[in-house]
Interface confidence: low
């Protein structure tokens, strides 16, 4: 139920493209193509084409997305598309001139002297957003999130976009400053993460984040499964990127437990994350006993 | 900063206590608490501690039997229920070291305790 | 919960010397442990947190090694004020945890 056709504007094309983008990924990483049938992965990438095709549709003259092109370009849709098409950098030809553009449009555009990134056009299906959907702390975790899009585009952009570190240290400095007075744990392990993407994870703000955590395994706000499931996946690739292979396995075993294996209305930042825990979790970790996945893929009849 | 239980008496068994564990020189709204129980001659025993916020976590022995509670940011109340003779012990109050967690940081400083004495 | 076994139970050393206690955890606790000395009639002390943290004024003779499962603490160049007992405590989690049953350390 993963593999999707995507298809609608520019923010639903997102919607649809996210679970086959993330499924291609997670099956590619964990090498478990053989069960489903190595053809399935030609048929996923070619509709992983058809949404980035798509999705340039709806690229605006600056470089940013919107989800229709007369509406005012979104920080947040852009820094997303970023997400998403430098992870499908590694599955189909992505022209690193349109994904370095938007990431040149966040940092010129977008970036306060003080680091933060301001959102002027907030998207309308709301419900794609995940936890940052909660306005509390949404400086912190807008910024934390284009950070790490940000981070995540590096490797390809570094060159193109000369301006990329020093955003990177401001969105990180800012993130710093403002860590010890979070207070939702969802903001505590996207900002967690952001700072373990650029080794600055430490106390005091190691201690935060790793007491953030409700009984060790999650970082969990009441009756919000599905940012409780976005938030935790964060912070296992902050455990992850820390080496800190002694907190990893109940966390793991928590995210395996709520078996939630993506899809359904509003699920799109809960199903890119927790595969992409997972899947970096099996990569980091070959010996995994805490994981037993019954995953299953469905590619859409034609 | 110091803390000093208060509280402590001889009971009868089934008879329910509450201990108040008082603080100076610092705010339980930025500092967590914890408790912790030594019956004679014995080793000590963790009971539970609560947060900032008022959240409170407990032993799985504990659960149910007692409560940690914030009465207001200088006194914590531990109230107990069910007692047994096999609850007799000094009760220490301690703070976390810092605002977080003391299972993770520690707890320090403590108080010097109070007695509970179960005896029919 | 999980189970900590401190060894050994007693132990003496003389001024000058090295004790070494060990604290072993029945499941892995990262480095959730600290270590507390206790003097008779008296309450617990923080000594060392999060494994190997040194507590605020605590003299840099005592020393917290480990991670996981398995924890020491050593005392290099004991002093006669050392004399107490030693008590670790490891948390899985808020409601899985618990203290080891205690070193007592004697100072000749």
């Known amino acids: 139920h993963l593999i999707v056709t995507p298809a609608g504007a520019g923010e639903q094309n997102m919607i649809g493209m996210t679970p086959t983008v993330i499924a291609v990924h997670y099956l590619d990483q964990t090498e478990q193509w053989e069960k489903f049938g190595i053809e399935k992965r030609q048929e996923a990438l070619e509709l992983i084409k058809k949404g980035y095709t798509q999705q340039l549709a709806f690229k605006q003259p600056s470089s940013a997305y919107a989800a229709f092109n007369n509406r005012p370009p979104s920080t947040w849709l852009t820094a997303y598309v970023v997400k998403v098409f430098s992870l499908a950098a590694n599955l189909i030809a992505i022209d690193s001139h349109v994904l370095c553009g938007a990431v040149k449009w966040l940092i010129l555009e977008k970036q306060k002297p003080d680091g933060v990134f301001q959102e002027d056009g907030p998207v309308i299906h709301q419900e794609m957003i995940g936890g940052f959907r909660n306005a509390k702390e949404a400086d912190v975790s807008l910024t934390a999130f284009v950070l790490i899009a940000l981070q995540e585009a590096r490797d390809i952009c570094e060159g193109q976009v000369n301006s990329l570190p020093g955003s990177i240290n401001k969105a990180g400095e800012y993130i710093e400053a403002s860590y010890m007075n979070l207070q939702r744990p969802y903001t505590v392990a996207i900002a967690g993460y952001a700072l373990a993407l650029m080794n600055k994870l430490e106390e005091p703000y190691l201690g935060k984040f790793l007491n953030t955590a409700k009984d060790r395994n999650r970082w969990e706000e009441p009756d919000q499964q599905l940012y409780n499931v976005e938030a935790t996946s964060y912070a296992l690739l902050a455990l992850l990127l820390l080496k800190d292979f002694d907190s990893v396995p109940p966390v793991v075993r928590w995210l395996n437990e709520q078996r939630y294996y993506g899809g359904g209305y509003g699920s799109t930042q809960a199903t890119f994350m927790v595969f992409q825990a997972l899947a970096q979790y099996q990569t980091d970790v070959p010996d995994h006993k805490d994981l037993n996945m019954d995953v299953s893929f469905h590619l859409p009849s034609r | 900063q110091s803390l000093e239980e208060s509280g402590g008496r001889l009971v009868t068994p089934g008879t329910p206590l509450t201990l108040t564990c008082t603080v100076s020189?610092?705010?339980?709204?930025?500092?967590?608490l914890g408790w912790v129980r030594q019956a004679p001659g014995k080793g000590l025993e963790y009971i539970g501690w609560?947060?900032?916020?008022?959240?409170a976590y407990y032993a799985s022995w504990a659960k149910g039997r007692f409560t940690i509670s914030k009465a207001s940011s200088t006194t914590v109340d531990l109230k107990m229920a069910g007692l047994t003779t096999e609850d007799t012990a000094t009760y220490f109050c301690?703070?976390?070291?810092?605002?977080?967690?003391?299972?993770?940081?520690?707890?320090?400083?403590w108080g010097p305790g109070t007695l509970v004495t179960v005896s029919s | 919960d999980p189970v900590l076994t401190q060894t050994p139970s007693s132990t003496s050393a003389a001024v000058g010397g090295t004790v070494t206690i060990k604290c072993q955890a029945s499941?892995?606790?990262?480095?959730?442990l600290a270590w507390y000395q206790q003097k008779p009639g008296q309450p617990p002390k923080l000594l060392i947190y999060?494994?190997?943290d040194l507590a605020s004024g605590v003299p840099s003779r005592f020393k917290g090694s480990g991670s996981g499962t398995q924890f020491t603490l050593t005392i290099s160049g004991v002093q006669r004020e050392d004399a107490a007992t030693y008590y670790c405590l490891g948390s899985y989690s808020s409601s899985d945890s618990a203290f080891g049953g205690g070193t007592e350390v004697v100072v000749k």
């Open positions: 999060r494994a190997s």
């Open positions: 609560i947060d900032s916020s008022g959240s």
């Open positions: 020189g610092f705010s339980l709204s930025t500092y967590t």
């Open positions: 301690a703070s976390g070291n810092t605002g977080g967690d003391p299972l993770y940081y520690g707890m320090d400083p």
């Open positions: 499941q892995n606790i990262g480095r959730w």
